[in-house]
């Protein structure tokens, strides 16, 4: 599942780079797959929000929130996400690159990075 998600993510990032005019020398944070979910490219100072991936609901059937589905806009309407929602993780794009996810996946989603590798 994760290999397929990763491949889809890289495609989305490529399309987003073209739309945003991003290239390797552009300031900001490149889109990335972090072994759990897909992060769109971002400008310095931008905070990006993602929902706990649907996969987590397979492992955690008690989880009751609705996760953001990736729509036709590749990365979904991330503007509709809010840190006041449960199951939302953020990263800040800084001059030094992406910040660590906050909260950590384990605490926001009940799922660890290491689980996605097995």
């Amino acid at each position: 599942i994760f290999k397929k998600e990763q491949a889809m993510c890289l495609e989305k990032i490529q399309r987003a780079n073209e739309l945003m005019g991003f290239n390797d020398s552009s300031p900001g944070c490149p889109g990335m797959w972090d072994n759990i979910t897909c992060w769109k490219p971002a400008h310095v100072g931008e905070m990006v929000l993602v929902s706990c991936p649907e996969l987590f609901r397979i492992f955690n059937p008690d989880q009751v929130w609705e996760t953001e589905t990736i729509g036709e806009s590749d990365f979904g309407d991330s503007n509709s996400l809010d840190l006041s929602d449960m199951g939302v993780v953020s990263r800040n794009c800084t001059e030094d690159g992406w910040s660590e996810p906050f909260p950590h996946y384990f605490d926001a989603c009940g799922f660890d990075e290491y689980e996605s590798e097995t």
Partner: antibody, heavy 123, light 107 residues
Framework: QVQLQQSGPGLVKPSQTLSLTCAIS??????????WNWIRQSPSRGLEWLGR?????????HYAVSVKSRITINPDTSKSQFSLQLNSVTPEDTAVYYC?????????????WGQGTLVTVSS | DIQMTQSPSSLSASVGDRITITCRAS??????LNWYQQKPGKAPKLLIY???SLQSGIPSRFSGSGSGTDFTLTINSLQPEDFATYFC?????????FGQGTKVDIK
């Protein structure tokens, strides 16, 4: 029925190491759906989460910054228990120490607790 | 660290009363909030998780609400066994901090 049974000395001398063990029955320390936590309680500091260990294809630990340089939480899979070691204790570490299981259901919560062990740090 | 502040620190009430305890987080924690009850000499006991979900086996007179930074625990029709100390706890981000407690005693 999950039960946590704590053991360890109630008196520790300053500068020495506090060691407590939490034996798990009705669950496994290697469970891939639980976390295993230590919390302490004192009149001056209230309830204070110290750290946790858990297994998700590898062992991980998270510790409170206030004790990070002195604390170790170790699982013992052969006995299905986990332990707390707190080094270089001072009288401020005097507290009731609890072990607890963390369970996930929308978030992490502590649903089963040990009986508590009063540890006094004194010479 | 996220600071959790409870109020009041103590309250006196009678059997049958409806009481409300509040908990405020120093930053938004969504609904990553739990409530515990503790009696003297005993370990804390989980009452409410995710701000408003009742833990299995807990009487329905206990209820929780809130989101973001402000949360409440309500006990409808206080029973003799409810006289205890109540703590809120955030599990949004480690370290998982607790409020200082609210002691409910008999008026």
């Amino acid at each position: 029925q999950v039960q946590l049974q704590q053991s360890g000395p109630g008196l520790v001398k300053p500068s020495q190491t506090l060691s407590l063990t939490c034996a798990i029955s009705g669950d496994s320390v290697s469970s891939n759906s639980a976390t295993w936590n230590w919390i302490r309680q004192s009149p001056s500091r209230g309830l204070e989460w110290l750290g946790r260990t858990y297994y998700r294809s590898k062992w991980s630990n998270h510790y409170a910054v206030s004790v990070k340089s002195r604390i170790t939480i170790n699982p013992d899979t052969s006995k299905s228990q986990f332990s707390l070691q707190l080094n270089s204790v001072t009288p401020e570490d005097t507290a009731v120490y609890y072990c607890a299981r963390g369970t996930w259901k929308q978030l992490w919560f502590l649903d089963h607790w040990g009986q508590g062990t009063l540890v006094t740090v004194s010479s | 660290d996220i600071q959790m502040t409870q109020s009041p620190s103590s309250l006196s009430a009678s059997v049958g009363d409806r009481i409300t305890i509040t908990c405020r987080a120093s930053q938004s924690i969504s609904r990553y909030l739990n409530w515990y009850q503790q009696k003297p000499g005993k370990a804390p006991k989980l009452l409410i998780y995710a701000a408003s979900s009742l833990q299995s086996g807990i009487p329905s007179r206990f209820s929780g609400s809130g989101s973001g930074t402000d949360f409440t625990l309500t006990i409808n029709s206080l029973q003799p066994e409810d006289f205890a100390t109540y703590f809120c706890q955030q599990s949004y981000s480690p370290p998982f901090t607790f409020g200082q407690g609210t002691k409910v005693d008999i008026k």
